[in-house]
């Protein structure tokens, strides 16, 4: 099951999974330039079985320029830099937590993929937050959200953080100090890993009552 | 024939995600048929080949619409056209009401 | 392209029969695979999604199965309400593609 809506959002933090329930997708997303190949897969899928987890499908971009031509999936040494995940950079995986049965470690990079990887999450994931760059953290509890199933719907627990502007980084759940902590990305860009379901939309359609996610016309 | 017709599917009471929008028309009478989707919060958009040059799929954020135009109309675009949330390997699990489009 | 061929393209049933509907597709596809049902006039309505999985709200009477190249799904008990057209949908590459759909019409 899905998880109908975003993690919350705690001002000055920000959150990433440490490792990814079965179920979860991600999208397949190229940098500009470039896009998926023809008959590619529209996003990757954490899939296994009761001993191993593992990325379902594999991204590949390709130049929009060029026809038919592929771009090589595995990157090169080089290219296996810091990336944005979610909405955090360099996935710092403890090992006890990534090899969780039933969970998927961070894929890693595809040649050309978009700069901001999209997950959505099934129910039972839990992300872990931590104060963006120059905010420090104040815990009143667990400084994590876990999406449960509650009556039939899905909701994300509230984590217990606030992040005070102090010149002082966070760090999560049993790390050493980040060498470079993660920096903070406008509010406009902090939306959307999952989207809820609950669109109330009443259609043009007046002869009946019915409501639809949807509204379609034409220009 | 020949003109172009431009259908907005609006989507309220929640974020516009960074699920797909998928377009999907039924001729009169006939099956389904997937034209292309796209993903609002990267804005692009991927297209079956038979539409390939014909149809221009975008999104606009801020009002929470996509939209789909198919150019250089022919007889055979007579259908209605329905767009949906595509959820990927969890289905297209809400569709608009449809817009019906015919070519005379 | 992957192609989905449904079979039968239509069938005759009375209420309480036992429907099963076949998909199947051109090349292994796991279980990317979703069910729609469609009535006259109307948008299509998820059913199953991941080959086996009941979308919320869906009565049990429904059920999915298979995986790689053959699915099928099967109304238990067939209702007034489930006279419609049944439609396969792969998604596991692009482009998506539709089987041609099944017509469950009444006896």
């Known amino acids: 099951e899905l998880c109908d809506d975003d993690p919350p959002e705690i001002p000055h933090a920000t959150f990433k999974a440490m490792a990814y329930k079965e179920g979860t997708m991600l999208n397949c997303e190229c940098k500009r330039g470039f896009r998926r190949i023809k008959s590619g897969s529209l996003y990757m899928l954490c899939t296994g079985n009761s001993s191993h987890s593992s990325w379902d499908n594999q991204c590949q971009c390709t130049s929009s320029a060029t026809r038919n031509t592929t771009k090589q999936v595995t990157p090169q040494p080089e290219e296996q830099k810091e990336r944005k995940t979610t909405e955090m950079q360099s996935p710092m995986q403890p090992v006890d937590q990534a090899s969780l049965p039933g969970h998927c470690r961070e894929p890693p990079p595809w040649e050309n993929e978009a700069t901001e990887r999209i997950y959505h999450f099934v129910v039972g994931q839990m992300v872990y937050y931590q104060c963006v760059q120059g905010y420090r953290a104040l815990h009143r509890g667990p400084a994590e959200s876990v999406c449960k199933m509650t009556h039939g719907k899905t909701r994300w627990t509230q984590p217990q953080l606030i992040c005070t502007g102090e010149m002082e980084t966070s760090q999560f759940p049993g790390e050493e100090k980040p060498q470079a902590s993660p920096e903070g990305r406008p509010e406009s860009e902090t939306s959307c890993l999952v989207t809820t379901t609950d669109f109330q939309i009443q259609t043009e359609m007046a002869a009946t009552m019915e409501t639809s996610i949807f509204t379609t016309e034409y220009q | 024939p020949g003109s172009s017709v431009k259908v907005s599917c609006k989507a309220s009471?929640?974020?516009?995600?960074?699920?797909?929008i998928s377009w999907v028309r039924q001729a009169p009478g006939q099956g389904l048929e997937w034209m292309g989707g796209?993903?609002?919060?990267?804005?692009?958009?991927n297209y079956a080949q038979k539409f390939q040059g014909r149809v221009t799929i975008t999104a606009d954020k801020s009002t929470s619409t996509a939209y789909m135009e198919l150019s250089s109309l022919r007889s055979e675009d007579t259908a209605v056209y329905y767009c949906?949330?595509?959820?990927?390997?969890?289905?297209?699990?809400?569709w608009g009401q449809g817009t019906t489009v015919t070519v005379s | 392209d992957i192609v989905m061929t449904q079979s039968p393209s239509s069938l005759s049933a009375s209420i309480g029969d036992r429907v099963t509907i076949t998909c199947r597709a051109s090349?292994?596809?796991?279980?990317?695979l979703n069910w729609y049902q469609q009535k006259p006039g109307k948008a299509p309505k998820l059913l199953i999604y991941?080959?086996?999985s009941l979308q919320n709200g869906v009565p049990s009477r429904f059920s999915g199965s298979g995986s790689g190249t053959d699915f099928t799904v099967t109304i238990s008990s067939l209702q007034p309400e489930d006279f419609a057209i049944y439609y396969c949908?792969?998604?596991?590459?692009?482009?998506?593609?539709f089987g041609g759909g099944t017509n469950v019409e009444i006896k």
């Open positions: 949906a949330r595509d959820k990927g390997y969890y289905g297209m699990d809400v």
């Open positions: 009471g929640g974020t516009f995600s960074s699920y797909a």
């Open positions: 796209i993903i609002p919060i990267f804005g692009t958009a």
């Open positions: 090349q292994s596809i796991k279980n990317y």
């Open positions: 991941a080959a086996s």
């Open positions: 949908q792969q998604t596991y590459s692009t482009p998506l593609t």
